[in-house]
């Protein structure tokens, strides 16, 4: 006999990175017939929604009109069908950005390199922060963390055409409060390779779209692949 329902999906629209004072909607998708959804923030009940009619609705939205550092943190949701509760969703890390300062992103040896060349990104921010984040735009994008007093190094190692794309970095004042984004740096990887099979170039979204990510405590910043299929359609529309 099943004791719990499958966990719901949780994500943020338009994005998990929210500029301060801007709006964001936290979405929770469970099952049709769910009579109650609960949103938890940092382990405590934050909001409740009871969809009407429950048999016609499998997703609820929790609206935050004015993002600030107090609203940034870890969210999860659960839902109930009858008396049976679901497993909790994955954790969604909601991050407030555009805090304080703007870092500078540079790439060595340069923005245009040869396939196989070792590339390092440098993110610099002179205000008090020790954690930096490097993000690459695009569908198969990911986030790297780096540490340093005023600058972090992000070695990509020998690059292939799969590394082509536009990168930005942030300074992180804590896990959920990030600086303004750096100016973008476009990395071009050129080079004729003989007898070498390289990954294809990433399909990328428009420059103002960052894709959707989840921050899980176990693995750090990571995209939720099941969720991605759902949200990619919205982002591409």
């Amino acid at each position: 006999q099943q004791q719990t329902l499958p966990k719901p999906f949780i994500w943020a629209e338009p994005h998990f990175m929210v500029p301060k004072e801007k709006q964001v909607t936290i979405c929770c998708q469970g099952n049709y017939g769910a009579v109650e959804y609960q949103l938890h923030f940092e382990g405590s009940l934050f909001a409740v929604d009871r969809p009407k009619p429950p048999e016609r609705i499998n997703k609820v939205q929790f609206y935050i009109p004015d993002m600030n550092s107090r609203m940034a943190g870890q969210y999860s949701c659960i839902y109930r069908v009858g008396e049976l509760w679901s497993e909790p969703s994955n954790l969604l890390d909601l991050v407030v950005t555009e805090m304080y300062d703007t870092p500078t992103l540079s790439v060595h040896p340069g923005p245009e390199v040869i396939s196989g060349e070792k590339v390092t990104f440098y993110c610099r921010l002179d205000t008090a922060t020790s954690m930096f984040l490097l993000l690459k735009e695009g569908r198969s994008s990911h986030v790297q963390r780096g540490y340093g007093k005023v600058q972090a190094e992000f070695p990509l190692g020998p690059v292939t055409t799969a590394h082509r794309g536009t990168y930005r970095c942030f300074g992180s004042y804590n896990n959920h409060a990030w600086s303004f984004p750096s100016e973008p740096v476009k990395l071009l990887v050129t080079g004729d390779i003989e007898n070498t099979s390289l990954a294809p170039e990433d399909p990328t979204f428009p420059a103002d779209t960052w894709g959707t990510y989840l921050l899980t405590t176990e693995t750090g910043l990571q995209k939720d692949h099941a969720l991605w299929d759902h949200t990619a359609q919205n982002l591409l529309r």
């Epitope: 540079s106 245009e112 396939s115 071009l188 080079g191 390779i193 070498t196």
Partner: antibody
């Protein structure tokens, strides 16, 4: 210390080919791209192209594409630049240079003279 | 292709004086600009990387500045061994291009 030692001077006939070598020591050869730059008598510096020794990726100045061929032999830490269909205007000193961001180390240069 | 233009073509300065060499890129290259010194019969030698970063073993009298399209190499007090040809180089995009050079000669 890092050293790039190039092969000796060459005198070639128009229409022939020349192959210049550059032996690297003092660093891990496959970790840096090797580039070739030439300098005609009394002229400035002109980039020919570069190669990534670890996977053989190359990038060429369009002006030399099809005539210049860059290769690298990891086992001997040696880079090669072959230039074909030589003409008198190819008379120059040819340098190899390691790209460590900038061209931080250069070979001593190889003089190639093209004359009938 | 990014065209690098150096000025002046020749600069005549007395030893002990200050020398200022200019380099302009045909489009923005951020700070991906490197400076080299070349003496007759020798290979170029790296002086400054990324517009303003000093190089180990290069005397402190050599300094660089600028970003975007306009760059400057300054030699604060010329020594006799500084008279040579100086080249700037675009490190931003392929083809990697050099300026035509500035010849620094004794006045």
């Amino acid at each position: 210390q890092v050293q790039l030692v190039q092969s000796g001077a060459e005198v070639k006939k128009p229409g022939s080919s020349v192959k210049v070598s550059c032996k690297a020591s003092g660093y891990t050869f496959s970790e840096y791209t090797m580039h070739w730059v030439r300098q005609a008598p009394g002229q400035g510096l002109e980039w020919i192209g570069g190669i990534s020794p670890n996977i053989g990726g190359t990038s060429y100045n369009q002006k030399f594409k099809g005539r210049a061929t860059l290769t690298a032999d990891k086992s001997t830490s040696t880079a090669y630049m072959e230039l074909s269909s030589l003409r008198s205007e190819d008379t120059a000193v040819y340098y190899c240079a390691r790209r460590g961001g900038s061209f931080d180390y250069w070979g001593q240069g190889t003089t190639v003279t093209v004359s009938s | 292709e990014i065209v690098m233009t150096q000025s002046p073509a020749t600069l005549s300065v007395s030893p002990g004086e200050r020398a200022t060499l200019s380099c302009r890129a045909s489009q923005s290259i951020s700070d991906y600009l490197h400076w080299y010194q070349q003496k007759p019969g020798q290979a170029p030698r790296l002086l400054i990387k990324y517009a303003s970063q000093s190089i180990s073993g290069i005397p402190a009298r050599f300094s660089g500045s600028g970003s975007g399209t306009d760059f400057t190499l300054t030699i604060s007090s010329l020594e006799p061994e500084d008279f040579a040809v100086y080249y700037c180089q675009n490190g931003h995009s392929f083809p990697l291009t050099f300026g035509q050079g500035t010849k620094l000669e004794i006045k």
